[in-house]
């Protein structure tokens, strides 16, 4: 779970070791500040929890990916 | 550790309704979701359908809609499970157990309750 | 729906042999998201494989499993007595998350 010691920086401490299914995503931001021990993501899944992942997995990456597309594309 | 305690056994007349408790402890009820099963005698597990608190999502087996109602109580950490109309069909044994909203698999089980249906 | 067809129906082995349990989906199970429960009689279900190859907490190494998109097996290396029970698999991609139909795993 991303931890907010200090308002408004929320850091993760430790990655999910699970891989999640896109279906299970709704979208994600990208965590870099310097005020943090390490770069993540963090996902937003359908239920309303929030996840810390490792960008460097490809699972992670990929992940990213399709939401940036499903973001792009236009909802008729 | 956590631990799904269910209500007792039930009998029930055909037409009734019978609603069944699924209490939680040593979790944080809000953070995982509830799903129903139930098990005929001699027959295999039968998913009717789940609540996710955190959400507010509930999804029923299309078998059951209509005729199965489940709610959360967040304040006393309870789950429900109400089946209406019911028949000897229904006579079996419900079971509630935990998952994990994001996966799904069931990780944590009640103990069950047996609820006859019977004239 | 995703149907899910487990085979056997019944597998008669003596402890020590090796069991492989199979389970079938009529459309593929994304990301691997099925689990194996094992349910002995007058006790509820308990949890054994997650995402298709996962041993739940506790779960001995005899019990693993494998497979993906529409194939899936449970194998038990070598019967101990108190596996002789009946193993479900089960989906959870997609709602209703449905349930095969069960093997029974008893002795010879």
């Known amino acids: 779970q991303p931890d907010a010691i200090n308002a408004p920086v929320t850091c993760c401490y430790n990655f999910t070791n699970r891989k999640i299914s896109v279906q299970r995503l709704a979208s994600y931001r990208r965590i870099t500040s310097s005020k943090c021990p390490k770069e993540a993501v963090i996902f937003k899944t359908i239920v309303a929890k929030e996840i810390c992942a490792d960008p460097k997995q490809k699972w992670v990456q990929d992940s990213m990916d399709h939401l940036d597309k499903q973001t792009q594309t236009p909802k008729t | 550790q956590v631990e799904l305690v269910q209500s007792g056994a039930e009998v029930k007349k055909p037409g009734s309704s019978v609603k069944v408790s699924c209490k939680a402890s040593?979790?944080?009820?809000?953070?995982?979701?509830i799903s129903w099963v139930r098990q005929a005698p001699g027959q295999g597990l039968e998913w009717m359908g789940a609540?996710?608190?955190?959400?507010?999502?509930?999804h029923y087996a299309q078998k059951f809609q209509g005729r199965v109602t489940i709610t959360a109580d967040e304040s006393t950490s309870t789950a429900y499970m109400e089946l209406s109309s019911l028949r000897s069909e229904d006579t079996a044994v419900y079971y509630c157990?935990?998952?994990?909203?994001?996966?799904?698999?069931?990780?944590?089980w009640g103990q069950g309750t047996l609820v006859t249906v019977s004239s | 729906d995703i149907v899910l067809t487990q085979s056997p129906a019944t597998l008669s082995l003596s402890p020590g042999e090796r069991a492989t349990l199979s389970c079938r989906a009529s459309?593929?199970?994304?990301?691997?998201?099925l689990a194996w429960y094992q349910q002995k009689p007058g006790q509820a279900p308990r949890l054994l494989i997650y995402d298709a190859s996962s041993r739940a907490t506790g779960v001995p190494a005899r019990f693993s499993g494998s497979g993906s998109g529409t194939d899936f097996t449970l194998t038990i290396s070598s019967l101990e007595p108190e596996d002789f029970a009946v193993y479900y698999c089960q989906q959870y991609i997609s709602f209703p998350a449905t349930f095969g139909q069960g093997t029974k795993v008893e002795i010879k």
């Open positions: 459309q593929s199970v994304s990301d691997a998201y």
């Open positions: 157990a935990r998952y994990d909203g994001i996966y799904g698999e069931l990780d944590f």
């Open positions: 609540i996710n608190p955190l959400a507010g999502h509930t």
């Open positions: 040593g979790g944080t009820f809000s953070s995982y979701g």
